[in-house]
Amino acid sequence: APVRSLNCTLRDSQQKSLVMSGPYELKALHLQGQDMEQQVVFSMSFVQGEESNDKIPVALGLKEKNLYLSCVLKDDKPTLQLESVDPKNYPKKKMEKRFVFNKIEINNKLEFESAQFPNWYISTSQAENMPVFLGGTKGGQDITDFTMQFVSS
């Protein structure tokens, strides 16, 4: 059976939107009006992995692009990147672990924990116009809480 996917946008808890920053990076900034069109639309795929009531494994692809968020070690540090894939083979139910995030719902907010690196989360900064990254702390300065907005196909 084909993998189930939905289209969505994400905003951090400061209401910053996510946009492309160069070919292989995302950044977070406040957008208004027509500029909202700049925000990236994700194709969130529901994939194989450890699942519970509040924890669902997903892959985050960029809609109509062969790019997926992935978590890899760079200089011995868990790092978030946009990785190019062969569109003929993706998305798939059994995604490689580096592409998998545990979508965790807490108090109507979402966290995205790396399956590859437990306790590392998709994060943004308080500052405007700075990259989205993989952070190893919750509840500190870095923002790990998001809301999801559904986008019609």
Epitope: S21, G22, K27, S125, A127, M130, F133, D142
Partner: antibody, heavy 118, light 107 residues
Framework: EVQLLESGGGLVQPGGSLRLSCAAS????????MFWVRQAPGKGLEWVSV????????RYADSVKGRFTISRDNSKNTLYLQMNSLRAEDTAVYYC???????????WGQGTLVTVSS | DIQMTQSPSSVSASVGDRLTIICRAS??????LAWYQQTPGNAPKLLIH???SLQSGVPSRFSGSGSGTDFTLTINSLQPEDFATYYC?????????FGGGTKVEIK
């Protein structure tokens, strides 16, 4: 008053290492992104590296990637740049700068000169 | 990487002149552009951020305009202390990049 004071520069042989420090005062250091920017003698400005307030997010210019490491100690209000495998083309004045709105450098230190020569 | 091209690379002007410096980005950077002034032996000083916003404490004779790929820094009525080198810098994406600089000399 915001102050940034770099130290640690000097003469080093090619292949050698150096660690630069930047002592910050007059603002809440732990809340700001920080940059290192360099300027070769008689040349323009070149961005080197950035670090987020928590230290989890770092980025580097291609020219220093794999050789330089940016870090910070928020308890000491200090920014660092560890420079390994130094080359003649790394000779420059190195500035630390506080990152302002959207990615500009709103305050700069006075710079420290690094000379790589045999 | 985004390339930033400044023109002219140097210019001779007189006190009281109106001066315009141009900065072009190799791709759209929205309004994520800053302008700096540097005098010999000193660190750069931020003049303008977000293409048009004057940094606190900077005289109002400095102004910035533009968005997308084409930007200008204008100095109305040059003062003796304005003879310096000016740099633009894009902050749209990493690696951040600077223009090559414009040296403003006394005619």
């Amino acid at each position: 008053e915001v102050q940034l004071l770099e130290s640690g520069g000097g003469l080093v042989q090619p292949g050698g290492s150096l660690r630069l420090s930047c002592a910050a005062s007059g603002f809440t250091f732990s809340k700001y992104f920080m940059f290192w920017v360099r300027q070769a003698p008689g040349k323009g400005l070149e961005w080197v590296s950035v670090i987020s307030p928590s230290g989890h997010m770092t980025r580097y210019a291609d020219s220093v990637k794999g050789r330089f490491t940016i870090s910070r100690d928020n308890s000491k209000n200090t920014l660092y740049l560890q420079m390994n495998s130094l080359r003649a083309e790394d000779t420059a004045v190195y500035y630390c700068a506080r990152v302002g709105y959207g990615g500009n450098s709103d305050y700069w230190g006075q710079g420290t000169l690094v000379t790589v020569s045999s | 990487d985004i390339q930033m091209t400044q023109s002219p690379s140097s210019v001779s002007a007189s006190v009281g002149d109106r001066l315009t410096i141009i900065c072009r980005a190799s791709q759209d950077i929205n309004r994520w552009l800053a302008w700096y002034q540097q005098t010999p032996g000193n660190a750069p000083k931020l003049l303008i951020h977000s293409a048009t916003s004057l940094q606190s404490g900077v005289p109002s004779r400095f102004s910035g305009s533009g968005s997308g790929t084409d930007f200008t820094l204008t100095i109305n009525s040059l003062q003796p202390e304005d003879f310096a080198t000016y740099y633009c810098q894009q902050a749209d994406s990493f690696p951040l990049t600077f223009g090559g600089g414009t040296k403003v000399e006394i005619k």
